[in-house]
Amino acid sequence: YPNASPLLGSSWGGLIHLYTATARNSYHLQIHKNGHVDGAPHQTIYSALMIRSEDAGFVVITGVMSRRYLCMDFRGNIFGSHYFDPENCRFQHQTLENGYDVYHSPQYHFLVSLGRAKRAFLPGMNPPPYSQFLSRRNEIPLIHFNTPIPRRHTQSAEDDSERDPLNVLKPRARMTPAPASCSQELPSAEDNSPMASDPLGVVRGGRVNTHAGGTGPEGCRPFAKFI
């Protein structure tokens, strides 16, 4: 890949943020430059991700600022790595009945989670909210992403196509806005009026379907109420 400004890459229009959402808050998964993975209450340059969909529901998740792949070790710890290991850095994506997404390691079976507990994914399970994710379009001005495009690092000296056999770093445009009918708040479990607990209107849209296929006839996702 040429060492050009990332702003010239078409994929930069497809940056997304994965976030967990409860009725009151949300945390965005971020991959720091040192490989530490945690959650932030807001979009940050380290929570801007590229998600490449592969066959059979597998995805590869890359932090664009850290230039690290989201990976998981055998204990279920998630971390960012410059090196792509297909066993550790590919995740099975599944959309739950509630429209939220879960990601788990096909190798170790643990869920990707922003909580500290490590839990294996079992079909039909209802994971805790900090293991369920939604996607939002990037809202951070691209000028803040003043870094080279992430690339796969390997010890070998093969050409770029060998270093990126899954074409992770040039993801196809697969971000589809949710239908207008989806842009509504979920009814609050506590309040009679959605505005009652959100008088400042802090819950706003921008969620997108980051993977091929919808969750229903209209591809709608839940609209979480968070601040």
């Epitope: 808050n25 945390y27 209450p41 909580g115 507990a117 900090y130 479990a189 802090v202 601040i227």
Partner: antibody, heavy 117, light 106 residues
Amino acid sequence: QVQLVQSGAEVKKPGASVKVSCKASGYTFTNHYMHWVRQAPGQGLEWMGIINPISGSTSNAQKFQGRVTMTRDTSTSTVYMELSSLRSEDTAVYYCARDIVDAFDFWGQGTMVTVSS
Amino acid sequence: AIQLTQSPSSLSASVGDRVTITCRASQGISSALVWYQQKPGKAPKLLIYDASFLESGVPSRFSGSGSGTDFTLTISSLQPEDFATYYCQQFNDYFTFGPGTKVDIK
């Protein structure tokens, strides 16, 4: 080390307002939501609301709608909780608590607010 | 909103006893439940997160179990410093607390 240090005890008249502060240190202030929880004498814990430290957006329990205002000052890593139209049943210890996604891991020492005529 | 109930509301026990406290949610909350210990005049202290995971620094005599709607906090061998009030809290929807269980000396 993480510390949440709250302002001192207050005595207020019914109908007045009180503003409690919570100064955070030992971590990146903007990376964690902050909550307010209160506890009336001899009673249990009651969640009041949450503030996003970077945007200042808040969300409150319905019970406190219109009476509680949560703010923050990022320059001093401090969050504030103001409760208005005080009544005797607002007499309680008020705590701030840091959210770490799956729990409240650090709590302030508590601020006793007494409402009495 | 999801309601949490705890039982018993209070119990008397002796040092060395095995103590079990239950917390029930009005609807399923997966494993998004935590347990706190609170002593008089002090802020709550986190014991268990995600229903069954021990917080760092908490003695191993404390354990948690359960998923969905029914949860349990167990103290395998009660120590003098364990006499306190214990609260559950759910993180699935809002942040409601249980009413508490007071453990005092028999």
